[in-house]
């Protein structure tokens, strides 16, 4: 028979034949052959693999470093990574929670809707049309664009959510 060019779900192609992938929580020891099944082995303590795979090494569980203010929110298993969170009163800097800050800053293009309290983190909001923020800040609101008209100037460059408008002199009509 013709060797396969594609395999079913949860299989992979090797040496012109389809082998079963290892299930989550297990790593590949040896590929299948014409006569043998794929050989898989469970991940060790503090290791995981979260997908059907052909990996020869399991991934290490994330370490929640207490020196960075991190603690374990959910212990990892052979199929899932450890989930870290921050100590009480501190906030993760990202979804991956790799470090902790007292309160998060709002990125350029966003302003502070509510300053952090002892209980809640900073609440950010996107700067609407007519407003901008060009800094990362835990305190600053979006600023309104400069009104060129009130300075008897015209808009030379439009503002964005991250930049103010640029004003310039009115074009003088030539005689």
């Amino acid at each position: 028979p013709e060797p396969p060019t594609a395999c079913r779900e949860k299989q992979y192609l090797i040496n012109s034949q389809c082998c079963s992938l290892c299930q989550p929580g297990q790593k590949l020891v040896s590929d299948c052959t014409e006569f043998t099944e794929t050989e898989c082995l469970p991940c060790g303590e503090s290791e995981f693999l979260d997908t059907w795979n052909r990996e020869t090494h399991c991934h290490q569980h994330k370490y929640c470093d207490p020196n960075l203010g991190l603690r374990v929110q959910q212990k990892g298993t052979s199929e899932t990574d450890t989930i870290c969170t921050c100590e009480e009163g501190w906030h993760c800097t990202s979804e991956a929670c790799e470090s902790c800050v007292l309160h998060r800053s709002c990125s350029p293009g966003f302003g502070v809707k509510q300053i952090a309290t002892g209980v809640s983190d900073t609440i950010c909001e996107p700067c609407p049309v007519g407003f901008f923020s060009n800094v990362s800040s835990a305190f600053e609101k979006c600023h309104p664009w400069t009104s060129c008209e009130t300075k008897d100037l015209v808009v030379q460059q439009a503002g964005t959510n991250k930049t103010d408008v640029v004003c310039g002199p009115q074009d003088r009509l030539r005689a």
Epitope: S99, C100, V101, L102, H103, V135, A138
Partner: nanobody, 116 residues
Framework: EVQLLASGGGLVQPGGSLRLSCAAS????????MIWVRQAPGKGLEWVSA????????YYADSVKGRFTISRDNSKNTLYLQMNSLRAEDTAVYYC?????????WGQGTLVTVSS
């Protein structure tokens, strides 16, 4: 390496005043939003006041509004906190920091004790 060294703390009577200073180095000071935080005995960190890089915008926690004034001298890379009408509940170790204030670097604080 970022270095932040707070000084100016001490023992003061209720109603008294103190001026804290913070010497900063290892980063571009005028570009950074700066913050004062404090930790009272047995309590967590509480933000007290913050100031924009230019010094044009200042922010205060409700507990110190009208009593404390934050300022900065960008030519000296120094942050200040003028504390007036001090109360017993202002007793804490005060730390300065740059935003975002990271868990792994607080710098050296200065102890303020308000007591008669």
């Amino acid at each position: 390496e970022v270095q932040l060294l707070a000084s100016g703390g001490g023992l003061v009577q209720p109603g008294g005043s103190l001026r804290l200073s913070c010497a900063a180095s290892g980063f571009t000071f005028p570009q950074e939003e700066m913050i004062w935080v404090r930790q009272a005995p047995g309590k967590g960190l509480e933000w007290v006041s913050a100031i924009s890089g230019s010094g044009g915008s200042t922010y205060y926690a409700d507990s110190v509004k009208g009593r404390f004034t934050i300022s900065r001298d960008n030519s000296k890379n120094t942050l200040y906190l003028q504390m007036n009408s001090l109360r017993a509940e202002d007793t804490a170790v005060y730390y300065c920091g740059k935003e975002p204030f990271r868990y792994d670097y607080w710098g050296q604080g200065t102890l303020v004790t308000v007591s008669s």
